[in-house]
């Protein structure tokens, strides 16, 4: 039977090294065996390159194409082939279809004045155009109460968020995740980072020295927990002092 594309390729670029195209066939397809996506930069002397797609679902194919560090003028010619049959042809401009990389290493640290300090890493090196363009959305949710969640927009430069412990339910377990977007590139949101989980406790920690804190996640009393807090605070300050000098 003839091979047909049901939903034509939709492509996004992380604007540093990879573009990903996804499309849907009209019936279950072994993408890697039956299809090839060729791509070529519209630039004098550019060679034709071939991407072997993989299955995301029975009839959904996805292709990850290595690209050079993208610039605004780059335009790629894309051709989807089933053997010698051209199924679809189109063009793709990475700068107009940006999906940022996922922020990394999301961690939660106790901070002064009963706040939690959420930190993550900018997924782009400083020399990349997107490094200074990213803003973030942080989602904080109660693991046991689906209706107890908060969304924070981080529009300043640093990949950090300070969260008052008192804004969350005491004794509850919370999870946070973060995603990024680049406003000036009119990008889509990145994928969410993996979640990180912590136990919220906002009564003054000093009052609980020697008292057991009901925390099935840690199995420590507050003395042990406080030692960890202090160590993390020192580590964090040292890290930032070191970073400042660079």
């Amino acid at each position: 039977g003839s091979v047909k594309v049901l939903h034509e390729p939709s492509c996004f670029s992380d604007y540093i090294s990879t573009s990903v195209c996804q499309w849907k066939m009209d019936h279950p397809t072994n993408c890697s065996a039956e299809l090839r996506l060729s791509y070529q930069l519209d630039f004098m002397g550019s060679e034709n390159h071939t991407c072997v797609p993989e299955n995301r679902e029975d009839s959904v194919c996805v292709c990850s194409m290595p690209i050079d560090d993208a610039v605004e003028a780059d335009v790629y010619q894309l051709d989807l082939w089933a053997g010698q049959q051209l199924l679809w042809s189109g063009s793709f401009q990475p700068s107009k279809h940006v999906k940022p990389r996922t922020p990394g290493n999301l961690t939660v640290h106790p901070n002064i004045s009963h706040t939690w300090l959420l930190m993550w890493t900018n997924p782009y090196p400083t020399e990349n155009h997107l490094h200074s363009e990213l803003t973030y959305m942080v989602n904080v949710s109660n693991d046991n109460d689906p209706e107890d969640f908060k969304v924070y927009n981080v529009t300043y430069m640093g990949p950090t968020l300070r969260l008052a412990a008192s804004t969350l339910k005491s004794g509850a377990s919370y999870s946070a995740r973060v995603r990024a977007w680049a406003q000036t590139y009119n990008s889509t949101w990145s994928d969410w980072s993996p979640s990180t989980t912590w136990l919220n406790y906002y009564e003054p920690w000093e009052q609980h020295l020697g008292k057991p804190i009901p925390n099935p996640l840690l199995g420590l009393d507050s003395t042990g927990l406080n030692d960890i807090f202090e160590a993390q605070k020192i580590e964090w300050h040292e890290h930032h002092h070191h970073h400042h000098h660079h």
């Epitope: 002397g45 550019s46 060679e47 390159h49």
Partner: antibody, heavy 125, light 112 residues
């Protein structure tokens, strides 16, 4: 040492054919696009044609399109220019030159960074 | 096609002086920040051309720092400081951005 040596230039009658060769050495030939540039007697430089490293992409000046064919044999490190239907105005010294690095997604550009010594093509009856 | 226009077409300079040659393109040669696809070549009498400057301002291997390229978009300049007798020849600009590649008419530099 990077070197390009052209050959094949000759005196030919209008309407005739000629094949120029350019043998390369001292660099990874297959990774680079190659270009032909010509210079009519007493005139300036005129670009003729370019071929990508794999040979998959070719480009031509309007003045030679349909008459000239650029090709390469990467196993022999050799660039060719097949010239058919030659005209008096094709009389020139023909130079081959190393152009952009095309093994990357976006070719890396260094200008025409090495030139051959040139070979003279004379089209006259 | 992109048209390349050089000025002046001839230039006479005394040894030790600075020579400047201008090249203007009919459309921008800026592909991305810092990437102007404009080259400068020198053809000495009886020789093949040789590369001097590529991407607007980058010196080709072995080219003395007396040669410098500047400009962006459509206006470019080649400067030769402390001119020497050996610098005599015809200087060409060329755009390498799109097919067909095109050269300027050439500027003949004569040393007094």
């Amino acid at each position: 040492e990077v070197q390009l040596v052209e050959s094949g230039g000759d005196l030919v009658k209008p309407g005739g054919s000629l094949r120029l060769s350019c043998v390369a050495s001292g660099f990874p030939f297959r990774d680079y696009a190659m270009t032909w540039v010509r210079q009519a007697p007493g005139k300036g430089l005129q670009w003729v044609s370019l071929i990508s490293g794999s040979g998959g992409k070719t480009y031509y000046a309007d003045a030679v399109k349909g008459r000239f064919t650029i090709s390469r044999d990467n196993a022999k490190n050799t660039l060719y220019l097949q010239m058919n239907s030659l005209r008096a105005e094709d009389t020139a010294v023909y130079y081959c030159a190393v152009d952009r690095l095309t093994k990357t997604i976006r070719p890396q550009y260094y200008g025409l960074w090495v030139w051959g010594q040139g070979t003279l093509v004379t089209v006259s009856s | 096609d992109i048209v390349m226009t050089q000025t002046p077409l001839s230039l006479s300079v005394s040894p030790g002086e600075t020579a400047s040659i201008s090249c203007r393109s009919s459309q921008s040669l800026l592909y991305s920040i810092g990437y102007n696809y404009l080259d400068w070549y020198l053809q000495k009498p009886g020789q093949s051309p040789q590369g001097l400057i590529y991407l607007g301002s980058k010196r080709a291997s072995g080219v003395p720092d007396r040669f410098s390229g500047s400009g962006s978009g459509t206006d470019f300049t080649l400067r030769i400081s402390r001119v020497e007798a050996n610098d005599t020849g015809v200087y060409y600009c060329m755009q390498g951005l799109q097919s067909p590649l095109t050269f300027g008419q050439g500027t003949k530099l004569e040393i007094k």
